[in-house]
Interface confidence: medium
């Protein structure tokens, strides 16, 4: 199946790259506006300039365009622990991120929350904390991994998955007790 082109894509495809077809006169190709600007008025005729105006404060366009309005700058979500990495400029949206020793957990495509990287206490760092992934820990002997924290095998109940990891430890304890009674 051939995907249908949208009206705007159809119109643009008639003109060479960097130009768009005049909405009222399809024989005219107008030059697109540079990033950081928006379309105020279409070019009056072939070879004549498109009237582009710079985006106002709080708005931007990040690529060449023929938008009638600039896009509103994103705001970092404080309730998600986000911090501003770089401010919005006329040609670039706000860049949001996390503080040092934190990683992003994406709840949806454009929505992330910042969480502290695990420290791997009672274990070692197997994989360092990344921008979008928590530290991966490996636990020392006598400890097992539960919710990415190293927990003592003394907290391991028979019904839990940790019994496999703590089995040598449990057998050692039993063995010591048995040898003490004979």
């Amino acid at each position: 199946l051939v995907p249908h082109l949208g009206d705007r894509e159809k119109r643009d495809s008639v003109c060479p790259q960097g130009k768009y077809i005049h909405p009222q006169n399809n024989s005219i190709c107008c030059t697109k506006c540079h990033k950081g600007t928006y379309l105020y008025n279409d070019c009056p005729g072939p070879g004549q300039d498109t009237d582009c105006r710079e985006c106002e404060s709080g708005s931007f366009t990040a690529s060449e365009n023929h938008l009638r309005h600039c896009l509103s700058c994103s705001k970092c979500r404080k309730e998600m622990g986000q911090v501003e990495i770089s401010s919005c400029t006329v040609d670039r949206d706000t860049v949001c991120g996390c503080r040092k020793n934190q990683y992003r957990h994406y709840w949806s495509e454009n929505l992330f929350q910042c969480f502290n990287c695990s420290l791997c206490l009672n274990g070692t760092v197997h994989l360092s904390c990344q921008e979008k992934q928590n530290t991966v820990c490996t636990c020392h002997a006598g400890f097992f991994l539960r919710e990415n924290e190293c927990v003592s095998c003394s907290n391991c109940k028979k019904s839990l998955e940790c019994t496999k990891l703590c089995l040598p430890q449990i057998e050692n304890v039993k063995g010591t007790e048995d040898s003490g009674t004979t």
């Epitope: 957990h105 994406y106 709840w107 949806s108 495509e109 929350q113 990415n148």
Partner: nanobody
Framework: EVQLLESGGGLVQPGGSLRLSCAAS????????MGWVRQAPGKGLEWVSM????????YYADSVKGRFTISRDNSKNTLYLQMNSLRAEDTAVYYC?????????????WGQGTLVTVSS
């Protein structure tokens, strides 16, 4: 077929409690983040709470922080929302939502909703 079935809504007095449940089927529950969204009468959708696939990470809207607790039981394919100290402004239809499939990172499936009415 993905199905999300909410239950536990009802009429409750201010200061009271309710526990919502969401029974999930038709997908591998343990692999997905889940969330609760609500829509008050005449208002837009509001994210209430979200929980990661393993239950470790949670998000709460400021309006419910300290009063609501999200949890999940992956062995039962069920999502929960414990709502305490309920207020009149918590009156809404509460929806259970499943997160994205693959690269289409959006909450792609919603339940039918359960109505919570807080009134004296």
């Amino acid at each position: 077929e993905v199905q999300l079935l909410e239950s536990g809504g009802g009429l409750v007095q201010p200061g009271g409690s309710l526990r919502l449940s969401c029974a999930a089927s038709g997908f591998t529950f343990i692999e997905y983040d889940m969330g609760w969204v609500r829509q008050a009468p005449g208002k837009g959708l509001e994210w209430v709470s979200m929980i990661s696939s393993d239950g470790r990470l949670t998000y709460y809207a400021d309006s419910v922080k300290g009063r609501f607790t999200i949890s999940r039981d992956n062995s039962k394919n069920t999502l929960y929302l414990q709502m305490n100290s309920l207020r009149a402004e918590d009156t809404a239809v509460y929806y259970c939502a499943k997160t994205w499939d693959g690269l289409n990172r959006n909450f792609d499936y919603w339940g039918q909703g359960t109505l919570v009415t807080v009134s004296s």
